[in-house]
């Protein structure tokens, strides 16, 4: 078939890095600059990504391949191949409409992306807060409150080892 | 071809004002939202602020007050009033198109002048 093919189709012949020029006889012509073919046997050449503004090349583009991009300092990749740059808030806060924010009382975010998240609730699985949380920080939970009664011991004992009621023989 | 490029930029004293434009072609420029970023020697690129293409506006906390964009659909331009200069607002100053319209989020479409010098000092 690929022999078949490339007798139809002279311009399977063509590598990557090049095109198939209808205008000069379906001659493999290299890209032009500042654009690339990445796979055999295309009709035009591809324009490079530029990385401007906000964007950093990471790569640059060949003949053969796009260019890729990060973002600079104080930014952050989102998106496949870092197709949008966010800005980075400091940890304690959320990037809003209207820029960063400090996290709302009740909300932490310890990265400098992302969104605020409530504090755990301690009491959902019958536990007491040992240390308070903060707008970088999540709650920590301890031992619920009934182990922390007067007498109760911070250690749960072992689970008897006959059933309870019956008397030992 | 899309261009943007920027003017205005310069010398001047603390407490002095300057006006940035960009003149933009090749693209709808009446229905583009604009932004305004900038980036200090040694320091984080940050945005400056922001246009709609109906005109609403947002700023930055540290220049909120100072300064002032604007658009001329009929001139294709955008513009940075900018007021009450400090020190630190010395900066490459950047216009760019603005697609995702979400603050602080440019995207691989956007496009990019290449830049004025602000620097303000006595």
């Known amino acids: 078939f690929e022999r078949t093919r490339s007798l139809q189709d002279p311009c399977s012949n063509c590598p990557a890095g090049t095109f198939c020029d209808n205008n000069r006889n379906q001659i493999c012509s290299p890209c032009p600059p500042n654009s690339f073919s990445s796979a055999g046997g295309q009709r035009t050449c591809d324009i490079c990504r530029q990385c401007k503004g906000v964007f950093r090349t990471r790569k640059e583009c060949s003949s053969t391949s796009n260019a890729e991009c990060d973002c600079t300092p104080g930014f952050h990749c989102l998106g496949a191949g870092c197709s949008m740059c966010e800005q980075d808030c400091k940890q304690g806060q959320e990037l809003t409409k209207k820029g960063c924010k400090d996290c709302c009382f009740g909300t932490f975010n310890d990265q400098k992306r992302g969104i605020c998240r409530p504090w755990t609730n301690c009491s959902l699985d019958g536990k007491s807060v040992l240390v308070n949380g903060t707008k970088e920080r999540d709650v920590v939970c301890g031992p619920s409150p009934a182990d922390l009664s007067p007498g109760a011991s911070s250690v749960t004992p072992p689970a008897p080892a006959r059933e309870p009621g019956h008397s030992p023989q | 071809q899309v261009q943007l490029v920027e003017s205005g930029g310069g010398l001047v004293q603390p407490g002095g004002s300057l006006r940035l434009s960009c003149a933009a072609s090749g693209f709808t420029f009446s229905s583009s939202a604009m932004s305004w970023a900038r980036q200090a020697p040694g320091k984080d690129f940050e945005w400056v602020s922001y246009?709609?293409?109906?005109?609403?506006?947002y700023y930055a906390d540290s220049v909120k007050g100072r300064f002032t964009i604007s658009r001329d659909n009929a001139k294709n331009t955008v513009y940075l009033q900018m007021n009450s200069l400090k020190p630190e607002d010395t900066a490459v100053y950047y216009c760019?198109?603005?697609?995702?319209?979400?603050?602080?989020?440019?995207?691989?479409?956007?496009?990019w002048g290449q830049g004025t010098q602000v620097t303000v000092s006595s």
């Open positions: 760019a198109t603005w697609h995702t319209l979400r603050v602080g989020v440019w995207d691989e479409y956007d496009y």
């Open positions: 246009i709609y293409s109906d005109g609403n506006t």
